[in-house]
Interface confidence: medium
Amino acid sequence: MGLPTVPGLLLSLVLLALLMGIHPSGVTGLVPSLGDREKRDSLCPQGKYVHSKNNSICCTKCHKGTYLVSDCPSPGRDTVCRECEKGTFTASQNYLRQCLSCKTCRKEMSQVEISPCQADKDTVCGCKENQFQRYLSETHFQCVDCSPCFNGTVTIPCKETQNTVCNCHAGFFLRESECVPCSHCKKNEECMKLCLPPPLANVTNPQDSGTAVLLPLVILLGLCLLSFIFISLMCRYPRWRPEVYSIICRDPVPVKEEKAGKPLTPAPSPAFSPTSGFNPTLGFSTPGFSSPVSSTPISPIFGPSNWHFMPPVSEVVPTQGADPLLYESLCSVPAPTSVQKWEDSAHPQRPDNADLAILYAVVDGVPPARWKEFMRFMGLSEHEIERLEMQNGRCLREAQYSMLEAWRRRTPRHEDTLEVVGLVLSKMNLAGCLENILEALRNPAPSSTTRLPR
């Protein structure tokens, strides 16, 4: 039997309605009708399109290999898509009402099928071995035999779309990738230059060959010298960049338990046993949980003070058939060992306490209804967002932190987190949220420290 979590759902919808009322910009897709389809779609975040009948709704596009059957019934609901029939395909995210027809390889052009048509990609046509594609138009090509370079040597081998490049022997010149005897060269033709007697054609500056060898050597030595100076300085002054120092100077860096640089949030946070360093005094209140054990609703409540912990699992044994979520820490602080991994790893972008505070302030400051859009703007792919959301399926806040942390890990260290976040929020017309984030960082609430993993 499905165990419903209705209060959580109702609350979500109420909050969504509030967001609509207070902040029309706070909900994606509340836009006036525009005739031009492309203009309308630009009003939705990447990977979404404007509902065909209700331009206040943004629906998720269909995955490649599928086509649109019906628009999403409401925001947050999935679009109904169907897989392309045999002989048809869609190669990218789309909202096409039907799939595209697969192309057939043209035998009369000597084409062969490299890979058959699949639901998510068109037929790939190519040429046999030792043939290349000679394009007759932008899309049509003919397969032609590669030149064997008789009376010459191969400079560049035959490629997919390019014939062999030949270097002709003396007494031959190149014409359409073939080495032709100079006797075929007529006066006033380009080949005259190539078919001149050797003494005239082959006058080179004796210095040239020496320069050609010496110059690269000089450059190489210079680079080696610079690298040596750089490494010496790094090892002498490790304060400059501890990360680089530890990598170059081979300073032993202890790495505990797991691979270095794993996400800070435990995957996906098992409930803490008394030994795991869980401090009961850190627990927040637990709204949304009532005494009946069998099908207690889960209520995801927003607001920094409402993220809460459950008692360690070892203290409560679930009765059979009970909702497992009852016995799970819905949003648990990552165990101290997880943070240890960060601190001990040679990860070039481990977040310091200031960074952690910023990430948590961002998590609390961006409206949940706009979170995914925010992460897309930050550069996370739809697939990555979805994976992290599923992986932290019981806790929105943990999922959000994981996403931000994934973004931070692949962002150059010199890029200021707040600056990037500020730019993105401004782009999303959420400058007010940025102010709230800055305010929260200026005046951290006494409880906020408990939210930071130690």
Epitope: T66, A369, R394
Partner: nanobody, 120 residues
Framework: EVQLLESGGGLVQPGGSLRLSCAAS????????MSWVRQAPGKGLEWVSG????????YYADSVKGRFTISRDNSKNTLYLQMNSLRAEDTAVYYC?????????????WGQGTLVTVSS
């Protein structure tokens, strides 16, 4: 009424295989992403794998990547989890979970679970 009914659990030796099924009813199955989540004895919940509504994108936890395969048959309203090369640490109650239609909570319905025991 939304119902999710898991089956296919049982006792299996390490290295063995099992196929779990989750029969869904009471909602438009093909419109929602689905996930498998497990709870080992005395431990917390661990998300195992997820699949999008059309069955085109699949997601796995690192601990099961390469061993487990999630799939779905929308015509039969059924979610599957093929588990190969099973290990003792895969012993758990496996739940299938439906993706929420509201913001922001990812799952809004869970099944009652099916017990998988990996032991020699």
């Amino acid at each position: 009424e939304v119902q999710l009914l898991e089956s296919g659990g049982g006792l299996v030796q390490p290295g063995g295989s099992l196929r779990l099924s989750c029969a869904a009813s009471g909602f438009t199955f093909g419109s929602y992403s689905m996930s498998w989540v497990r709870q080992a004895p005395g431990k917390g919940l661990e998300w195992v794998s997820g699949i999008d509504n059309g069955g085109h994108s699949t997601y796995y936890a690192d601990s099961v990547k390469g061993r487990f395969t999630i799939s779905r048959d929308n015509s039969k309203n059924t979610l599957y989890l093929q588990m190969n090369s099973l290990r003792a640490e895969d012993t758990a109650v496996y739940y299938c979970a439906k993706r929420s239609s509201g913001l922001p909570f990812p799952f809004d319905y869970w099944g009652q679970g099916t017990l998988v025991t990996v032991s020699s």
